[in-house]
């Protein structure tokens, strides 16, 4: 049903009124305001911004706006003892040192408290040794090195280029390979798009630019010292030795000028193939160690960062629902940045601010949403999704009973080519219907819908005439809501053309050059893409909070479950002999998917026909829809990842950013041919099929008629 049937509705107070109130000029103004100084988590500046947002959300008209604080483990460089990397000669003299910080961008020369590039949560240490170049440090890169090239990384310092996978996975892989240190760098092949100038004359990364970022492997734990529970005033904290996800070897990031100096001397093995070569004028030799004349020189890391328990602040705003105040639709994005946060996160925070202002305007005119909307400005996302996770841990009982949906609102843009959406299949139809009603901001699509330009530029690989919608992975604040609590979640932003731009993310990601001017001059001068993202995110929240029947279609889940079952079966069928030997069958899973499909179809028919004027039946049907995502949660979690509990989706074990389907089965099958005990390994595959089949069947039954 249309949103117009929601409460206290007048013709003026519908989705159109909400969308019409969103203004590009306001988003621009808010972005400027949020990006003039750094807002690093745990700093006074970020606390002041939290209080400013609290005050402004109250002025905008929310019913209440509170700060929720937690004391979590953060990481900072030592101000008097900077981190750097050296090349040392045989006498131990430092003959080359990497930069201590990035040259500041024009207009920001006198800004204080710019944190120098560092890898958050790196342990202290001064390892020295030979260098090994490990490409992107992916699982497959280490397989290539160790299995094919017979290169041993044990006791070596490895240098890896950023890109392809989450940096924490790189560090974990290096640790498992026995490395004693990791140097991360941005290669121009990944962070310098051809034909574009470097900042401040374009959106490319200068040679002195460096990507900051955390290197944790939290697997959804939140604060490393209080996994599973909020880091509140009476929290019991683990000792640092028992903390979750901390790296055990020193790690440090550098730019491509400094990387050139390290890589140009590399000797040893040649790169195995062209996929290991970047764009620097170096041989990309793997090592170990330097070539001929330089073979006595070593690399030494000097890392002095410290881990500190520090107070962080979320801002939580409430717009109470008129009919179902105990049903929560959440819009959340983070506020903390590495430096200025021109894109990450403030392009998202500015959009949230304008969405709150628009909802507040409607509320001041007498309107209320049907369901409660919660708005969140999360802290310490950059340090491991800490603010959102701690708040969700503190409120988990409420959320698991009342949480309808979570819409994430980090960076609004990572390009200006087309829309990018990742969400639960329950939201596919909502996103399709909404984007058909919105105007495309794209050149050449004047007067056309957003759906049309999106579908043209980013077509679905499976369904013609439909746009691509991706699986949710992690690396952002939806993680705890979706992967741990099973609350239907989605995210949307404008993105680049992935076909022509092969670089990873956007070039200036997490560097000092991510400024307001970067956005205003190069990405979105008219802020029309920001406005479109505001309309998508805000429109989704509006519909989720206001539709009489929740805008979820369970049939879309049935479709993807079949696709995922086919995919995982195909992977398993690469081992036909073992499947036969160990009696591995997917029959139970396919049967459960078939049952789910049939039950979902019948449920959808009932959804069309039931008496929507009966509040009890309406609530019952909506609850079945709301709790469907919850039904995919296994309370025991995935093996060795207790906070990843969704059986259908989890962040890839090899790349936190990517989503994996049927992750339990996938991980059990991964590299199974190398397992020392095949019987045990295939037994785990069978167990995971059983868990998946049971879960799908159990979820299907939540959609059956209740009696």
């Amino acid at each position: 049903k249309s949103s117009n049937e929601a409460t206290n509705i007048t013709p003026k107070h519908n989705m159109k009124a909400f969308l019409d109130e969103l203004k590009a000029e306001n988003i621009k103004k808010f972005l400027y305001n949020f990006t003039q100084i750094p807002h690093l988590a745990g700093t006074e500046q970020n606390f002041q911004l939290a209080k400013q947002i609290q005050s402004q959300w109250k002025e905008f008209g929310l019913d209440s706006v509170e700060l929720a604080h937690y004391d979590v483990l953060l990481s900072y460089p030592n101000k008097t003892h900077p981190n750097y990397i050296s090349i040392i000669n045989e006498d131990g003299n430092e003959i080359f040192n990497t930069s201590l910080f990035e040259p500041p961008p024009p207009g920001y020369e006198n800004v204080s408290d710019i944190v120098p590039p560092f890898s958050a949560f790196s342990p202290q240490g001064m390892p020295e040794g030979d260098l090994v170049y490990v490409n992107y440090a992916r699982t497959e890169d280490f397989f290539k090195l160790e299995r094919d090239m017979k290169i041993n990384c044990s006791g070596k310092i490895v240098i890896a280029r950023y890109g392809k996978v989450f940096r924490g996975n790189k560090v974990k892989n290096a640790q498992l390979a026995g490395a004693k240190g990791v140097i991360l760098y941005s290669d121009p092949a990944d962070y310098f798009a051809p034909g574009v100038k470097s900042y401040p004359d374009g959106w490319n990364l200068p040679g002195g630019g460096v990507q900051r970022g955390n290197i944790l492997n939290l697997n959804g734990a939140g604060d490393p010292l209080t996994p599973g529970y909020p880091a509140n005033e009476y929290a019991y904290r683990r000792g640092i030795a028992e903390a979750v996800g901390l790296p055990s070897i020193p790690v440090h990031p550098i730019g491509y000028y400094d990387a050139q100096k390290l890589l140009e001397k590399m000797g040893g093995s040649a790169p195995p193939d062209s996929s290991w070569r970047g764009s620097l004028k170096v041989p990309y030799n793997v090592g170990p160690g330097f070539t001929g004349n330089f073979s006595t020189q070593k690399v030494k890391m000097h890392i002095h960062s410290t881990n500190e328990v520090t107070r962080i602040y979320n801002v939580i705003g409430t717009l109470r629902g008129a009919v179902e105040p105990d049903r929560y639709v959440i819009l959340g994005g983070h506020r903390d940045s590495w430096v200025f946060g021109g894109i990450d996160p403030q392009s998202g925070a500015a959009v949230v601010h304008e969405i709150v202002r628009s909802f507040g305007t409607l509320k001041k005119e007498g309107w209320r949403p049907r369901r409660t909307i919660l708005f969140a400005s999360w802290d310490a996302e950059e340090f491991g999704l800490l603010g959102s996770t701690e708040w969700a841990e503190e409120n988990s009982r409420l959320l698991q009973e009342r949480g309808v949906a979570y819409i994430n609102a980090d960076s609004s843009i990572e390009g200006n080519y087309t829309l990018r959406v990742d969400c639960t299949p329950l939201m596919y139809s909502l996103v399709h219907n909404l984007t058909k009603e919105l105007k495309s901001p794209d050149e050449g699509f004047e007067g056309k819908s957003l759906y049309e330009s999106w579908t043209k530029k980013s077509p679905s690989p499976e369904f013609s005439g439909m746009p691509r919608i991706s699986k949710l992975g992690s690396g952002n604040d939806f993680e705890v809501f979706f992967q741990r609590l099973g609350i239907a979640s989605g995210r949307a932003r404008y993105t680049k053309n992935w076909e022509t731009n092969k670089f990873s993310g956007y070039p200036l990601y997490h560097s000092v050059y991510e400024t307001y001017e970067l956005v205003e001059k190069f990405y979105d001068p008219m802020f029309k893409y920001h406005l479109t993202v505001a309309q998508v995110r805000g429109g989704m929240v509006f519909e989720l909070a206001n539709s009489i029947v929740l805008p979820f279609d369970c049939r879309d889940y049935a479709v993807v479950l079949r696709k995922y079952a086919d995919k995982i079966y195909s992977i398993s069928m690469k081992h036909p002999q073992e499947m036969k030997t160990y009696s591995v069958s997917f029959d139970s899973l396919f049967s459960a998917v078939k049952n789910f499909t049939e039950i979902a179809s019948k449920f959808s028919e009932r959804l069309q026909d039931f008496d929507k004027s009966n509040p009890i039946v309406l609530r019952m049907m909506n609850d079945q829809l709301m709790f469907l995502e919850r039904a995919f949660i296994d309370p025991l979690g995935l093996p060795d990842r207790p906070f990843y509990r969704h059986v259908i989706y989890a962040p890839s074990s090899h790349n936190k950013y990517a989503g994996e389907s049927f992750p339990g089965i996938y991980d059990a099958l991964f590299d199974i041919e190398s397992k020392v005990d095949p019987s045990k390994a295939w037994g785990e595959v069978k167990r995971q099929i059983y868990v998946a089949a049971f879960t799908v069947q159990a979820a299907a039954e939540t959609l059956s008629e209740v009696a």
Partner: antibody
Framework: EVQLVESGGGLVQPGGSMRLSCAAS????????MAWVRQAPGKGLEWIAN????????YYADSLKGRFTISRDNSKNTLYLQMNSLRAEDTAVYYC?????????????WGQGTTVTVSS | DIQLTQSPSSLSASVGDRVTITCRAS?????IYWYQQKPGKAPKPWIY???NLASGVPSRFSGSGSGTDYTLTISSLQPEDFATYYC?????????FGQGTKLEIK
């Protein structure tokens, strides 16, 4: 051969104006930031101004802002420095220089310099 | 603005001597550049990004340092090395130069 040749120097009275030119050859002019640097007699080097690839952004030493204007004509491979309200302390050798790496570059190619004398 | 102070301002040395010129910044910079200038001539780029020798610069020259303290070293002074050397920072606008170190024959 990469070359920068300055011209336009000479004697000028205090309060007067002068325009210096720098002709570039041997490289793709529009691919580089350019700069002016000066050196007073018997003194050290002083950066005056920078200009980006297409002339859309200019950067000046605070002490000279408002009196000096840097510009370029990429079609003529020429850099300019317009100097107004000249003072005796502006007497110096003026060098045109190429920035090696955009905004953050250093000066990797220098002209031979042109002498400006401000005197009555 | 970042001030660069070179020491010594002038230095008398003999052919074959090892010579070190220092450049101290008023606040931390990521790199220093060095130029050589001979009388009546334009400066020449000599060392870039602290430790990289410009094209044609002999290997007896080396550069090192980080933060606020940088050095240019000549391992064995040759007759053609007598000149004035300037350090420069291009880290924080505006670009600034040291006052110069004049290297003279003893």
């Amino acid at each position: 051969e990469v070359q920068l040749v300055e011209s336009g120097g000479g004697l000028v009275q205090p309060g007067g104006s002068m325009r210096l030119s720098c002709a570039a050859s041997g490289f793709t002019f529009s691919d580089y930031y350019m700069a002016w640097v000066r050196q007073a007699p018997g003194k050290g080097l002083e950066w005056i101004a920078n200009i980006n690839y297409d002339g859309s952004n200019t950067y000046y030493a605070d002490s000279l802002k408002g009196r000096f204007t840097i510009s370029r004509d990429n079609s003529k491979n020429t850099l300019y420095l317009q100097m107004n309200s000249l003072r005796a302390e502006d007497t110096a050798v003026y060098y045109c220089a190429r920035n090696w790496d955009g905004y953050y570059g250093y000066f990797d190619v220098w002209g031979q310099g042109t002498t400006v004398t401000v005197s009555s | 603005d970042i001030q660069l102070t070179q020491s010594p301002s002038s230095l008398s040395a003999s052919v074959g001597d090892r010579v070190t010129i220092t450049c101290r910044a008023s606040s931390s910079v990521s790199h220093i550049y060095w130029y050589q200038q001979k009388p009546g001539k334009a400066p020449k780029p000599w060392i870039y990004r602290t430790s990289n020798l410009a094209s044609g610069v002999p290997s007896r020259f080396s550069g090192s340092g980080s933060g606020t303290d940088y050095t240019l070293t000549i391992s064995s002074l040759q007759p053609e090395d007598f000149a004035t050397y300037y350090c420069q920072q291009y880290h924080t606008y505006p670009p600034t130069f040291g006052q110069g170190t004049k290297l003279e024959i003893k």
